[in-house]
Interface confidence: low
Amino acid sequence: AMDLILINSLPLVSDAETSLTCIASGWRPHEPITIGRDFEALMNQHQDPLEVTQDVTREWAKKVVWKREKASKINGAYFCEGRVRGEAIRIRTMKMRQQASFLPATLTMTVDKGDNVNISFKKVLIKEEDAVIYKNGSFIHSVPRHEVPDILEVHLPHAQPQDAGVYSARYIGGNLFTSAFTRLIVRRCEAQKWGPECNHLCTACMNNGVCHEDTGECICPPGFMGRTCEKACELHTFGRTCKERCSGQEGCKSYVFCLPDPYGCSCATGWKGLQCNEACHPGFYGPDCKLRCSCNNGEMCDRFQGCLCSPGWQGLQCEREGIQRMTPKIVDLPDHIEVNSGKFNPICKASGWPLPTNEEMTLVKPDGTVLHPKDFNHTDHFSVAIFTIHRILPPDSGVWVCSVNTVAGMVEKPFNISVKVLPKPLNAPNVIDTGHNFAVINISSEPYFGDGPIKSKKLLYKPVNHYEAWQHIQVTNEIVTLNYLEPRTEYELCVQLVRRGEGGEGHPGPVRRFTTASIGLPPPRGLNLLPKSQTTLNLTWQPIFPSSEDDFYVEVERRSVQKSDQQNIKVPGNLTSVLLNNLHPREQYVVRARVNTKAQGEWSEDLTAWTLSDILPPQPENIKISNITHSSAVISWTILDGYSISSITIRYKVQGKNEDQHVDVKIKNATITQYQLKGLEPETAYQVDIFAENNIGSSNPAFSHELVTLPESQAPADLGGGKMLL
């Protein structure tokens, strides 16, 4: 997508002003263009930094200008670099003294892998010295002084990519400033081939265009454009779309154009010579005047454009009859488009003859990404390419370019895309009032995040049920009434804002939950849940006297806390209890009930109970004896839930007395966890046991606890917390 061009004016430096201009045509770089010395090509050239300035005549161009007094510091190799999406495109060129002892035949030479190549330098000064040839600054070849020919040549019978580089020639007594340079570019592939494996056939690039070995595209010489470089530009214009213009009195005279490899450097069409200041001879045209006109039907030959065909004829030699080719034109593309973030399908529409094909239309994002059409159609007069961006975001805002490149020429149209953030309310809607079948809502649509203006608002609502789909109503006011709701149902609410344009529906805002009022009967009163046995619980309630004549029944739902086990039981309305059976011993159950007619009633609060135990209870835990005085002591303990413990027994006796002389204290309230023993003898050791009883029997104490009362004079410590029986 980057059309980078380096203009070297003039490559042979005398005492006149000389310059390098680097132009990024039809492309807006995010990173600046740089011009620098190419030390890769020539290590030992001048080290001075370059004074790079903005070219005032062009938006995206940089320039280095050397005044005549700096002529001695100019010799060397240079580059211009542009970056797009992190990928660098570098164009190389050279400048040398016009007074050098040798001059190259051409500034650059592009050959295919395997070609038989002669790199030649013309001798312009005769000296009694050996001639030497260097490649990238390293010596490769010398010619004895008596054998230096008029044309000094380096012969490469089978050129390989590693042969590429800057070749220089001079006399041995000379230096960098008397050297002549030429750059050999060796395409990675053999003639007419491209691709990673060089197994694709190149498009026929006309008018001395060069096939790029990585993309298969033609790099067109200055003055030609289109997919095959067949289309000549208007006079004195250049660039991929012929939009750039040479401003000199004689057009592009004295401009050497350097393009990305493997093109190298050449004159613009109509000019030749190392300085591009010689016009083509009659019958020749094109870059470096290398193309010969052989126009059919006696048509005119123009040194810039080649054969000028009469209407109805076309081709390089006007050899084909047919409709005249028409450079493509991009139509119906506004300069500015506002887009909502999300999916975006931009359309590029173009005319021309032949009509552009799917492959010939592309869309370039501001970051340089090239998109190809996802869909394509055409009418008699237009081709329409539809592109798909699955998720366009605000950072994608900027200048996009629709590009069309056919055999009839190339055109690019930049347009500005402004990506908007979809609006989303910051607050959840508020519920002002509810009934059993309606709710009054304040939709709280402002403030919102994202871009306006808001075109419409939707209130979305649904029951909080795994399978219910969202329903919505369009709203214009901030206060809205939702009707036809289900009673005793929890609903979710949220607001969706819509801004203008396609895909303007924002993400729904925060969710508010509310529950509609009940119209069912109230739950049974006086509910009581008690264990009956190891496998049954008994649920009882007060008699129900409904106000209407409708048949009714009690629905009881029980579920196990420990297991995924749930059961619903229907009980006739005239009963006041139900035995829940087939339960598991020592398991906790949650039960609730409601009174149903045709409409379902309101559920009661949850009741919880354990079935009776099927094993002896475990010993009370955390047994502590504290607050000991001369005649009393406090015993505390904890018991485990779920073992149907009905009572706690404390057994104590004076140590050493017979077993049958013990005292038993039975505590029938199992929620009590503390007891004060009284009437004890001072300074006496007691043996204390504590055990729990349930429906199966008593727990087995593991060991006894010892308690020694204090002498009569000592004061007791503070009393501990907990429920206590005195």
Epitope: P463, V464, N465, H466, Y467, E468, A469, E486, E555, E557, S564, Q566, Q567, N568, K570
Partner: antibody
């Protein structure tokens, strides 16, 4: 004890309709979501349709959308699947399955019927 | 649509040995995963829900683990009645509910 019994399967030609039924017992039918799940011969399980306890909300897999309709009659404790425009690829055993959650549908199935075979062939 | 991928397709195990079945989700499903057992000619039977909870009446040799995208069903010591096809099912996204392709556990 929860029981689900499917009926209505059989052999039909492509394009013809068929209606499956599932009789439910042993639980409060109108509080549970119900689904149809099918299994082509020798293949895995594919969820087809779901209906909420009240019958107010339904959802279908894309493969049957517009052709199949799920419904229920809570007074008869019966679930239905109306299948129109049947295709050869609809050949399968159709199971009716009870959602495990009562108060809110959970999306997995604690009880399944034994299934009814639907064969679509020309 | 959330895609569930079960591996291996077939698992050959000797009675008494441990079996480990895997289920991978194409996106995060938290713990919303169930496992079912299906024997030839029978309907599927719920074994595990919420990735690690055993359904009522399921022996404790069956256990489930995992969350997010990687889940495992482990049968600690295979009994003869455990040889069957096992399916995982996600219910994080019910549009649609989806099942894995199944793992067949066969006698080695």
């Amino acid at each position: 004890d929860v029981q689900l019994v499917e009926s209505g399967g059989g052999e039909v030609r492509p394009g013809e309709p068929l209606r499956l039924s599932c009789a439910a017992s042993g639980f409060t039918f109108n509080t549970y979501g119900m689904s149809w799940v099918r299994q082509a011969p020798g293949e895995g399980l594919e969820w087809v349709s779901v209906i909420s306890g009240s019958g107010g909300s339904t959802y279908h897999a894309d493969s049957v959308k517009g052709r199949f309709t799920i419904s229920r009659d809570n007074s008869k404790n019966t679930l239905y699947l109306q299948m129109n425009s049947l295709r050869v690829e609809d050949t399968a055993i159709y199971y009716c399955a009870k959602d495990s959650g009562s108060w809110t549908s959970s999306g997995f199935f604690d009880y399944w019927g034994l299934g009814t075979l639907v064969t679509v062939s020309s | 649509e959330i895609v569930l991928t079960q591996s291996p397709g077939t698992l050959s195990v000797s009675p008494g040995e441990k079996a480990t079945l895997n289920c991978r989700a194409s996106q995060n499903i938290n713990s919303k995963l169930a496992w079912y057992q299906q024997k030839p000619g029978q309907a599927p039977r719920l074994l595990i829900y919420d990735a690690g909870n055993r359904a009522a009446g399921i022996p404790d040799r069956f256990s489930g683990s995992g969350s997010g995208t990687e889940f495992t069903l482990t049968i600690s010591s295979l009994q003869s009645e455990d040889f069957a096809v096992y399916y995982c099912q996600q219910y994080y996204d019910w549009r649609p509910l989806t099942f894995g392709g199944g793992t067949k556990v066969e006698i080695k």
